[in-house]
Protein backbone atom coordinates (compact mmCIF):
# COMPACT_ATOMS: atom_id res chain seq x y z
CA UNK A 1 0.00 0.00 0.00
CA UNK A 2 1.39 3.42 -0.93
CA UNK A 3 2.33 5.73 1.92
CA UNK A 4 3.06 9.40 2.41
CA UNK A 5 5.54 10.62 5.01
CA UNK A 6 5.74 14.17 6.35
CA UNK A 7 8.54 15.73 8.36
CA UNK A 8 8.67 19.28 9.67
CA UNK A 9 12.02 20.79 10.63
CA UNK A 10 12.98 24.09 12.18
CA UNK A 11 16.22 25.55 10.89
CA UNK A 12 18.85 25.44 13.64
CA UNK A 13 20.32 28.76 12.59
CA UNK A 14 17.07 30.65 12.08
CA UNK A 15 14.20 29.90 14.43
CA UNK A 16 11.76 31.69 12.13
CA UNK A 17 12.52 29.35 9.21
CA UNK A 18 10.85 25.99 8.80
CA UNK A 19 11.05 23.29 6.17
CA UNK A 20 8.39 20.71 5.39
CA UNK A 21 9.64 17.52 3.73
CA UNK A 22 7.15 15.09 2.16
CA UNK A 23 7.62 11.87 0.27
CA UNK A 24 5.60 9.23 -1.51
CA UNK A 25 6.35 5.53 -1.19
CA UNK A 26 4.42 3.69 -3.86
CA UNK A 27 3.97 2.92 -7.55
CA UNK A 28 2.61 5.08 -10.35
CA UNK A 29 3.68 8.42 -11.71
CA UNK A 30 3.20 11.37 -9.38
CA UNK A 31 1.03 13.94 -11.07
CA UNK A 32 0.58 16.56 -8.40
CA UNK A 33 1.61 17.33 -4.82
CA UNK A 34 -0.45 19.70 -2.68
CA UNK A 35 0.93 21.07 0.60
CA UNK A 36 -1.39 22.77 3.08
CA UNK A 37 -1.30 23.92 6.68
CA UNK A 38 -3.92 23.90 9.40
CA UNK A 39 -5.35 20.65 8.04
CA UNK A 40 -5.93 18.98 4.68
CA UNK A 41 -6.79 21.12 1.69
CA UNK A 42 -10.57 21.23 1.43
CA UNK A 43 -11.08 20.44 5.11
CA UNK A 44 -10.25 23.79 6.62
CA UNK A 45 -6.60 23.78 5.64
CA UNK A 46 -4.92 26.55 3.66
CA UNK A 47 -3.01 25.69 0.50
CA UNK A 48 0.68 26.56 0.65
CA UNK A 49 2.02 25.04 -2.55
CA UNK A 50 1.16 22.90 -5.56
CA UNK A 51 3.95 21.06 -7.35
CA UNK A 52 3.59 19.51 -10.80
CA UNK A 53 6.44 17.35 -12.19
CA UNK A 54 6.29 18.97 -15.63
CA UNK A 55 4.51 22.29 -15.26
CA UNK A 56 6.41 23.57 -12.25
CA UNK A 57 5.39 24.86 -8.85
CA UNK A 58 3.05 27.46 -7.43
CA UNK A 59 3.28 28.71 -3.87
CA UNK A 60 1.51 31.10 -1.54
CA UNK A 61 2.82 33.07 1.44
CA UNK A 62 4.27 32.21 3.87
CA UNK A 63 5.81 29.57 1.58
CA UNK A 64 9.25 30.72 0.41
CA UNK A 65 10.42 27.94 -1.87
CA UNK A 66 8.79 24.72 -3.03
CA UNK A 67 10.93 22.20 -4.89
CA UNK A 68 11.28 18.57 -5.88
CA UNK A 69 14.00 16.76 -3.94
CA UNK A 70 13.59 13.49 -5.85
CA UNK A 71 10.98 12.14 -8.26
CA UNK A 72 8.91 11.16 -5.26
CA UNK A 73 9.70 13.72 -2.57
CA UNK A 74 9.41 17.48 -2.16
CA UNK A 75 10.45 20.17 0.26
CA UNK A 76 8.80 23.44 1.16
CA UNK A 77 10.66 26.24 2.91
CA UNK A 78 8.57 28.58 5.06
CA UNK A 79 9.41 31.99 6.44
CA UNK A 80 7.68 32.75 9.73
CA UNK A 81 7.47 36.53 9.88
CA UNK A 82 5.62 36.59 13.21
CA UNK A 83 7.60 36.74 16.44
CA UNK A 84 5.32 34.20 18.13
CA UNK A 85 6.36 31.43 15.71
CA UNK A 86 2.89 29.98 14.95
CA UNK A 87 4.42 27.22 12.82
CA UNK A 88 5.56 25.44 15.97
CA UNK A 89 2.02 24.23 16.70
CA UNK A 90 0.76 23.93 13.13
CA UNK A 91 -0.16 20.79 11.24
CA UNK A 92 1.21 20.50 7.71
CA UNK A 93 -0.39 18.14 5.22
CA UNK A 94 0.91 16.70 1.96
CA UNK A 95 -1.27 15.06 -0.66
CA UNK A 96 0.31 13.07 -3.49
CA UNK A 97 -1.78 12.30 -6.56
CA UNK A 98 -0.36 9.30 -8.38
CA UNK A 99 -1.86 8.08 -11.66
CA UNK A 100 -3.64 5.77 -11.99
CA UNK A 101 -3.64 4.65 -8.36
CA UNK A 102 -5.14 7.78 -6.83
CA UNK A 103 -4.33 10.11 -3.95
CA UNK A 104 -2.64 9.56 -0.62
CA UNK A 105 -2.19 12.17 2.07
CA UNK A 106 -0.60 12.53 5.47
CA UNK A 107 -0.10 15.29 8.01
CA UNK A 108 2.65 16.13 10.46
CA UNK A 109 3.90 18.87 12.72
CA UNK A 110 7.09 20.03 14.37
CA UNK A 111 8.17 17.51 17.05
CA UNK A 112 7.65 18.85 20.62
CA UNK A 113 11.40 18.58 21.25
CA UNK A 114 11.95 21.19 18.55
CA UNK A 115 10.19 23.90 20.57
CA UNK A 116 11.93 27.23 19.81
CA UNK A 117 11.79 28.01 23.54
CA UNK A 118 14.38 25.33 24.25
CA UNK A 119 17.94 26.54 24.66
CA UNK A 120 19.56 24.00 22.36
CA UNK A 121 18.72 24.07 18.66
CA UNK A 122 16.98 20.92 17.36
CA UNK A 123 18.99 18.16 15.79
CA UNK A 124 17.68 17.57 12.26
CA UNK A 125 16.20 14.12 11.86
CA UNK A 126 17.51 12.18 8.84
CA UNK A 127 15.02 12.40 6.01
CA UNK A 128 13.71 9.13 4.68
CA UNK A 129 14.57 9.06 1.00
CA UNK A 130 11.84 7.48 -1.06
CA UNK A 131 14.17 6.90 -3.99
CA UNK A 132 16.68 4.71 -2.18
Amino acid sequence: TPEVWVQVQMEATELSSFTVHCGFLGPGSISLVTVSWGGPDGAGGTKLAVLHPELGTRQWAPARQARWETQSSISLALEDSGASSPFANTTFCCKFASFPEGSWESCGSLPPSSDPGLSAPPTPVPILRADL
Partner: antibody
Framework: DVKLVESGGGLVKLGGSLKLSCAAS????????MSWVRQTPEKRLELVAA????????YYPDTVKGRFTISRDDAENTLYLQMSSLKSEDTALYYC?????????????WGQGTSVTVSS | SIVMTQTPKFLLVSAGDRVTITCKAS??????VAWYQQKPGQSPKLLMY???NRFTGVPDRFTGSGYGTDFTFTINTVQAEDLAVYFC?????????FGGGTKLEIK
Protein backbone atom coordinates in the same frame (compact mmCIF):
# COMPACT_ATOMS: atom_id res chain seq x y z
CA ASP B 1 -10.24 23.46 -29.19
CA VAL B 2 -9.88 20.11 -27.39
CA LYS B 3 -11.43 17.32 -29.44
CA LEU B 4 -11.71 13.58 -28.78
CA VAL B 5 -13.28 11.42 -31.49
CA GLU B 6 -13.96 7.73 -30.86
CA SER B 7 -14.39 5.09 -33.56
CA GLY B 8 -14.39 1.31 -34.00
CA GLY B 9 -17.61 0.42 -32.23
CA GLY B 10 -20.20 -1.92 -33.69
CA LEU B 11 -22.08 -5.19 -33.36
CA VAL B 12 -19.93 -8.10 -32.22
CA LYS B 13 -20.65 -11.70 -31.32
CA LEU B 14 -20.33 -13.04 -27.78
CA GLY B 15 -16.67 -13.95 -27.17
CA GLY B 16 -15.55 -11.76 -30.05
CA SER B 17 -13.03 -8.93 -30.22
CA LEU B 18 -13.10 -5.26 -31.13
CA LYS B 19 -10.57 -2.44 -31.13
CA LEU B 20 -11.69 1.09 -30.32
CA SER B 21 -9.74 4.20 -31.28
CA CYS B 22 -9.84 7.75 -29.99
CA ALA B 23 -8.28 10.50 -32.10
CA ALA B 24 -7.18 13.49 -30.01
CA SER B 25 -6.57 17.02 -31.25
CA UNK B 26 -6.33 20.57 -29.94
CA UNK B 27 -3.97 19.75 -27.05
CA UNK B 28 -0.61 18.13 -26.30
CA UNK B 29 -1.83 14.53 -26.11
CA UNK B 30 1.41 13.19 -24.57
CA UNK B 31 0.98 15.46 -21.52
CA UNK B 32 -2.29 13.93 -20.38
CA UNK B 33 -3.47 10.80 -18.63
CA MET B 34 -6.33 9.20 -20.53
CA SER B 35 -9.19 6.80 -19.81
CA TRP B 36 -11.99 4.82 -21.37
CA VAL B 37 -15.34 5.12 -19.60
CA ARG B 38 -18.47 3.26 -20.65
CA GLN B 39 -22.12 4.09 -20.19
CA THR B 40 -24.38 1.08 -19.86
CA PRO B 41 -27.88 0.88 -21.36
CA GLU B 42 -29.11 1.72 -17.83
CA LYS B 43 -27.07 4.96 -18.12
CA ARG B 44 -24.53 4.08 -15.42
CA LEU B 45 -20.96 5.29 -15.94
CA GLU B 46 -18.08 2.90 -15.38
CA LEU B 47 -14.31 3.29 -15.81
CA VAL B 48 -12.94 0.45 -17.95
CA ALA B 49 -9.30 1.41 -18.44
CA ALA B 50 -6.81 4.18 -17.67
CA UNK B 51 -3.30 4.93 -18.90
CA UNK B 52 -0.72 7.39 -17.58
CA UNK B 53 0.71 10.11 -19.81
CA UNK B 54 4.02 8.25 -20.19
CA UNK B 55 2.17 5.02 -21.01
CA UNK B 56 4.02 3.14 -18.27
CA UNK B 57 1.08 2.72 -15.88
CA UNK B 58 -2.30 1.24 -16.68
CA TYR B 59 -5.37 0.36 -14.64
CA TYR B 60 -8.27 -2.03 -15.23
CA PRO B 61 -11.17 -2.84 -12.93
CA ASP B 62 -11.74 -6.52 -12.19
CA THR B 63 -14.72 -6.60 -14.59
CA VAL B 64 -12.44 -6.24 -17.63
CA LYS B 65 -8.99 -7.27 -16.35
CA GLY B 66 -7.33 -9.78 -18.68
CA ARG B 67 -9.80 -9.05 -21.48
CA PHE B 68 -9.23 -5.35 -22.26
CA THR B 69 -5.97 -3.57 -23.07
CA ILE B 70 -5.49 0.18 -23.19
CA SER B 71 -2.63 1.68 -25.18
CA ARG B 72 -1.59 4.97 -26.71
CA ASP B 73 0.36 6.23 -29.68
CA ASP B 74 1.63 9.72 -28.89
CA ALA B 75 3.03 10.16 -32.41
CA GLU B 76 -0.44 9.61 -33.82
CA ASN B 77 -2.27 11.33 -30.93
CA THR B 78 -4.44 8.26 -30.57
CA LEU B 79 -5.77 6.22 -27.65
CA TYR B 80 -6.80 2.59 -28.13
CA LEU B 81 -8.88 -0.01 -26.35
CA GLN B 82 -8.45 -3.61 -27.45
CA MET B 83 -11.40 -5.67 -26.22
CA SER B 84 -11.52 -9.45 -26.37
CA SER B 85 -13.66 -12.29 -24.95
CA LEU B 86 -16.56 -9.85 -25.05
CA LYS B 87 -19.56 -10.50 -22.81
CA SER B 88 -23.13 -9.26 -23.05
CA GLU B 89 -22.48 -6.94 -20.10
CA ASP B 90 -19.86 -5.13 -22.19
CA THR B 91 -22.66 -3.68 -24.30
CA ALA B 92 -22.37 0.07 -23.77
CA LEU B 93 -21.46 3.43 -25.20
CA TYR B 94 -17.68 3.82 -24.85
CA TYR B 95 -16.21 7.24 -24.19
CA CYS B 96 -12.59 8.31 -24.31
CA UNK B 97 -11.77 10.97 -21.71
CA UNK B 98 -8.88 13.18 -20.64
CA UNK B 99 -7.74 13.61 -17.03
CA UNK B 100 -6.58 16.99 -15.77
CA UNK B 101 -3.89 16.82 -13.07
CA UNK B 102 -4.84 20.20 -11.64
CA UNK B 103 -8.47 19.11 -11.30
CA UNK B 104 -7.78 16.11 -9.10
CA UNK B 105 -7.99 13.66 -12.03
CA UNK B 106 -11.46 14.87 -12.96
CA UNK B 107 -12.23 14.21 -16.63
CA UNK B 108 -12.35 17.62 -18.28
CA UNK B 109 -12.92 16.46 -21.87
CA TRP B 110 -14.98 13.60 -23.30
CA GLY B 111 -15.53 12.31 -26.80
CA GLN B 112 -18.97 11.75 -28.33
CA GLY B 113 -18.77 8.01 -27.70
CA THR B 114 -18.80 4.88 -29.83
CA SER B 115 -21.42 2.17 -29.36
CA VAL B 116 -20.54 -1.47 -28.71
CA THR B 117 -23.24 -4.14 -28.83
CA VAL B 118 -22.40 -7.73 -27.90
CA SER B 119 -24.94 -10.20 -29.24
CA SER B 120 -25.38 -13.92 -28.86
CA SER C 1 -14.04 -0.10 -5.03
CA ILE C 2 -15.43 3.04 -3.46
CA VAL C 3 -19.20 3.22 -3.85
CA MET C 4 -20.77 6.61 -4.53
CA THR C 5 -24.41 6.64 -3.49
CA GLN C 6 -26.24 9.49 -5.17
CA THR C 7 -29.71 10.74 -4.21
CA PRO C 8 -32.33 11.40 -5.40
CA LYS C 9 -32.60 9.49 -8.68
CA PHE C 10 -35.19 11.87 -10.10
CA LEU C 11 -36.03 15.52 -9.54
CA LEU C 12 -39.03 17.33 -10.98
CA VAL C 13 -38.72 21.05 -10.44
CA SER C 14 -39.94 24.38 -11.74
CA ALA C 15 -37.69 27.00 -13.32
CA GLY C 16 -36.40 29.25 -10.58
CA ASP C 17 -36.34 26.50 -7.93
CA ARG C 18 -33.28 25.57 -5.90
CA VAL C 19 -32.10 21.99 -6.35
CA THR C 20 -29.84 19.92 -4.10
CA ILE C 21 -28.26 16.56 -4.98
CA THR C 22 -26.26 14.55 -2.47
CA CYS C 23 -23.51 12.00 -2.90
CA LYS C 24 -22.21 9.74 -0.14
CA ALA C 25 -18.92 7.86 -0.48
CA SER C 26 -18.43 4.44 1.14
CA UNK C 27 -15.09 5.69 2.52
CA UNK C 28 -13.31 9.04 2.69
CA UNK C 29 -12.43 10.48 -0.71
CA UNK C 30 -10.92 13.70 0.68
CA UNK C 31 -11.93 16.56 -1.64
CA UNK C 32 -11.44 14.54 -4.83
CA VAL C 33 -15.02 14.78 -6.06
CA ALA C 34 -16.21 16.00 -9.43
CA TRP C 35 -19.71 16.66 -10.77
CA TYR C 36 -20.77 16.16 -14.39
CA GLN C 37 -23.78 17.20 -16.43
CA GLN C 38 -25.07 15.04 -19.27
CA LYS C 39 -27.71 16.61 -21.47
CA PRO C 40 -29.91 14.35 -23.64
CA GLY C 41 -27.95 12.85 -26.53
CA GLN C 42 -24.65 14.35 -25.36
CA SER C 43 -21.55 13.13 -23.57
CA PRO C 44 -20.91 14.09 -19.93
CA LYS C 45 -19.42 17.53 -19.29
CA LEU C 46 -17.35 18.53 -16.28
CA LEU C 47 -19.05 21.09 -14.04
CA MET C 48 -17.15 20.98 -10.74
CA TYR C 49 -13.81 19.62 -9.60
CA UNK C 50 -12.23 19.39 -6.15
CA UNK C 51 -15.80 19.52 -4.80
CA UNK C 52 -16.39 23.25 -5.11
CA ASN C 53 -14.35 24.56 -8.04
CA ARG C 54 -16.34 25.48 -11.13
CA PHE C 55 -14.92 24.37 -14.46
CA THR C 56 -14.36 26.99 -17.19
CA GLY C 57 -17.59 28.61 -18.34
CA VAL C 58 -19.80 27.01 -15.69
CA PRO C 59 -22.36 29.54 -14.34
CA ASP C 60 -22.10 30.49 -10.67
CA ARG C 61 -25.59 29.13 -9.95
CA PHE C 62 -23.85 25.73 -9.70
CA THR C 63 -22.13 25.15 -6.35
CA GLY C 64 -20.61 22.20 -4.52
CA SER C 65 -19.62 21.47 -0.95
CA GLY C 66 -18.44 18.67 1.34
CA TYR C 67 -15.37 16.74 2.39
CA GLY C 68 -14.59 13.13 3.25
CA THR C 69 -17.74 11.12 2.64
CA ASP C 70 -20.62 13.57 2.28
CA PHE C 71 -21.04 15.89 -0.69
CA THR C 72 -23.71 18.24 -1.92
CA PHE C 73 -24.29 19.74 -5.35
CA THR C 74 -26.68 22.67 -5.63
CA ILE C 75 -28.27 24.51 -8.54
CA ASN C 76 -29.58 27.85 -7.39
CA THR C 77 -32.37 29.20 -9.59
CA VAL C 78 -32.80 26.28 -11.99
CA GLN C 79 -33.16 27.20 -15.66
CA ALA C 80 -34.79 25.25 -18.48
CA GLU C 81 -31.35 24.56 -20.01
CA ASP C 82 -30.35 22.65 -16.85
CA LEU C 83 -32.50 19.70 -17.94
CA ALA C 84 -29.96 16.86 -17.73
CA VAL C 85 -28.63 13.93 -15.74
CA TYR C 86 -26.05 14.88 -13.09
CA PHE C 87 -23.34 12.51 -11.88
CA CYS C 88 -20.89 12.72 -9.00
CA UNK C 89 -17.53 10.99 -9.30
CA UNK C 90 -14.71 10.25 -6.89
CA UNK C 91 -11.19 10.60 -8.28
CA UNK C 92 -9.50 9.71 -4.99
CA UNK C 93 -8.74 6.02 -5.60
CA UNK C 94 -8.91 3.89 -8.71
CA UNK C 95 -11.17 2.76 -10.04
CA UNK C 96 -12.69 6.22 -10.28
CA UNK C 97 -16.35 5.56 -9.53
CA PHE C 98 -19.52 7.45 -10.34
CA GLY C 99 -22.82 7.94 -8.60
CA GLY C 100 -25.90 6.45 -10.25
CA GLY C 101 -27.03 9.82 -11.57
CA THR C 102 -29.86 12.24 -10.87
CA LYS C 103 -32.27 13.03 -13.68
CA LEU C 104 -33.44 16.61 -13.47
CA GLU C 105 -36.71 17.38 -15.21
CA ILE C 106 -38.32 20.79 -15.52
CA LYS C 107 -42.10 21.16 -15.02
Amino acid sequence: DVKLVESGGGLVKLGGSLKLSCAASGFTFSSYHMSWVRQTPEKRLELVAAISRDGDSTYYPDTVKGRFTISRDDAENTLYLQMSSLKSEDTALYYCSRHEDYFGFAMDSWGQGTSVTVSS
Amino acid sequence: SIVMTQTPKFLLVSAGDRVTITCKASQSVSNDVAWYQQKPGQSPKLLMYYVSNRFTGVPDRFTGSGYGTDFTFTINTVQAEDLAVYFCQQAYRSPWTFGGGTKLEIK
